[in-house]
């Protein structure tokens, strides 16, 4: 991937809007299509007062762990969907788009250097275990995807890109 492409806000914006579209297509989290089993996903909540004061390396660890778990979750959802009778075509399309989007984002983050933080977390902070929750509907899964991109990922890339510009 071209260096620092993730720092172009339009790139992340495209994935955010795709995630939002996927969420909308699942017709609300109460009555939308259910997953045949619960899937573990990252907790996307951000306490921005604390997040703002985290070292960018610590943010990278949280983002990378979240991205990995989210990728696993959507691949798991794809497998469950493949085994279901008559999977809705539009849902399938959005699962495929999400998988493709997460792969691209993973590559773009690698260029930004997020992965090396995971390999060697800063000494001062042994990364806290990632907080997780479960999704039981496709809507909740896509909502987590959307929240993760808009929240931790966007906040981290904003800070990492700003630092790179200095």
């Amino acid at each position: 991937a071209p260096p620092r492409l993730i720092c172009d806000s339009r790139v992340l914006e495209r994935y955010i809007l795709e995630a939002k579209e996927a969420e909308n297509v699942t017709m609300g989290c109460a009555e939308g299509p259910r997953l045949s089993e619960n899937i573990t996903v990252p907790d996307t909540k951000v306490n921005f007062y604390a997040w703002k004061r985290m070292k960018v390396e610590e943010q990278a660890v949280e983002v990378w762990q979240g991205l990995s778990l989210l990728s696993e979750a959507i691949l798991q959802a794809q497998a469950l969907q493949a085994n279901s009778s008559q999977p809705p075509e539009s849902l399938q399309l959005h699962i495929d788009k999400a998988i493709s989007g997460l792969r691209s984002l993973t590559s773009l983050l690698r260029v930004l250097g997020a992965q090396k933080e995971l390999m060697s977390p800063p000494d001062a902070t042994q990364a806290a275990p990632l907080r997780t929750l479960t999704a039981d509907t496709f809507c909740k899964l896509f909502r987590v995807y959307s929240n993760f991109l808009r929240g931790k990922l966007k906040l981290y890339t904003g800070e990492a890109c700003r630092r790179g510009d200095r």
Epitope: E13, I16, L17, K20, C29, T44, K45, V46, N47, F48, Y49, A50, K52, R53, K140, R143, N147, F148, R150, G151, K152, K154, L155, G158
Partner: antibody, heavy 123, light 109 residues
Framework: QVQLVQSGAEVKKPGSSVKVSCKAS????????ISWVRQAPGQGLEWMGG????????DYAQKFQGRVTITADESTSTAYMELSSLRSEDTAVYYC????????????????WGRGTLVTVSS | SYVLTQPPSVSVAPGKTARITCSGD??????VHWYQQKPGQAPVLVIY???ERPSGIPERFSGSNSGNTATLTISRVEAGDEADYYC???????????FGGGTKLTVLG
């Protein structure tokens, strides 16, 4: 039921300071950030800053940086907003708002509000 | 910093549908929250995360966010809906909460 009870109205001289309190009841005080929002007469809402009681970290809107201090006292479940170097344009109703994570949100929103404290700055 | 623009006023007849808009650059990239404020009272959250309703808020209130505009829709408007309405987003670049200028909803008649 979450309730935020704010201190009473204040009249202050230009150049002085005011400290408004906001006492929370219901729910765990330390679990939720408190924001302060002000509203000048006939005007819209303006975020001043907020505090995370767990860490004690506070953040302020650029406009108020250096003039506002937000603190929280966990023992009394009370948040405070102090504004210094008051001028007539600071005449406003000052609200505290407790943030809450609704299901499916990555960011807390201002779910509960105090009734407001009118601060009048006049010589 | 990020700017949200709302029309200063909207008028609607009782029983009709009111639409209050809030525009900003790339607004679909943000989650939009809406507050209702009646005269002399504190604001009340009526919609969060574009289109979700907190408990206790009537189903008549709904929200959407696409294009360059977020919209608060109030169907079957009642006299009690007369109030100021504010949109709000969290601007990640400045780490600030940002409010729109507010829209005064007047219920005619």
């Amino acid at each position: 039921q979450v309730q935020l009870v704010q201190s009473g109205a204040e009249v202050k001289k230009p150049g002085s300071s005011v400290k408004v309190s906001c006492k929370a009841s219901g729910g765990t005080f330390r679990s939720y950030a408190i924001s302060w929002v002000r509203q000048a007469p006939g005007q819209g809402l303006e975020w001043m800053g907020g505090i995370d009681p767990i860490s004690g970290f506070a953040d302020y809107a650029q406009k108020f940086q250096g003039r506002v201090t937000i603190t929280a006292d966990e023992s009394t479940s009370t948040a405070y907003m102090e504004l210094s170097s008051l001028r007539s344009e600071d005449t406003a109703v000052y609200y505290c708002a407790r943030e809450l994570y609704y299901p499916g949100t990555w960011m807390a929103v201002m779910a509960y509000w105090g009734r407001g404290t009118l601060v009048t700055v006049s010589s | 910093s990020y700017v949200l623009t709302q029309p200063p006023s909207v008028s609607v007849a009782p029983g009709k549908t009111a639409r209050i808009t809030c525009s900003g650059d790339n607004i679909p990239e943000y989650y939009v929250h809406w507050y209702q404020q009646k005269p002399g009272q504190a604001p009340v959250l009526v919609i969060y995360r574009d289109n979700e309703r907190p408990s206790g808020i009537p189903e008549r209130f709904s929200g959407s966010n696409s294009g360059n505009t977020a919209t608060l829709t109030i169907s079957r408007v009642e006299a009690g809906d007369e109030a100021d309405y504010y949109c709000q987003v969290f601007d990640e670049s400045s780490w600030h909460w940002v409010f729109g200028g507010g829209t005064k909803l007047t219920v005619l008649g």
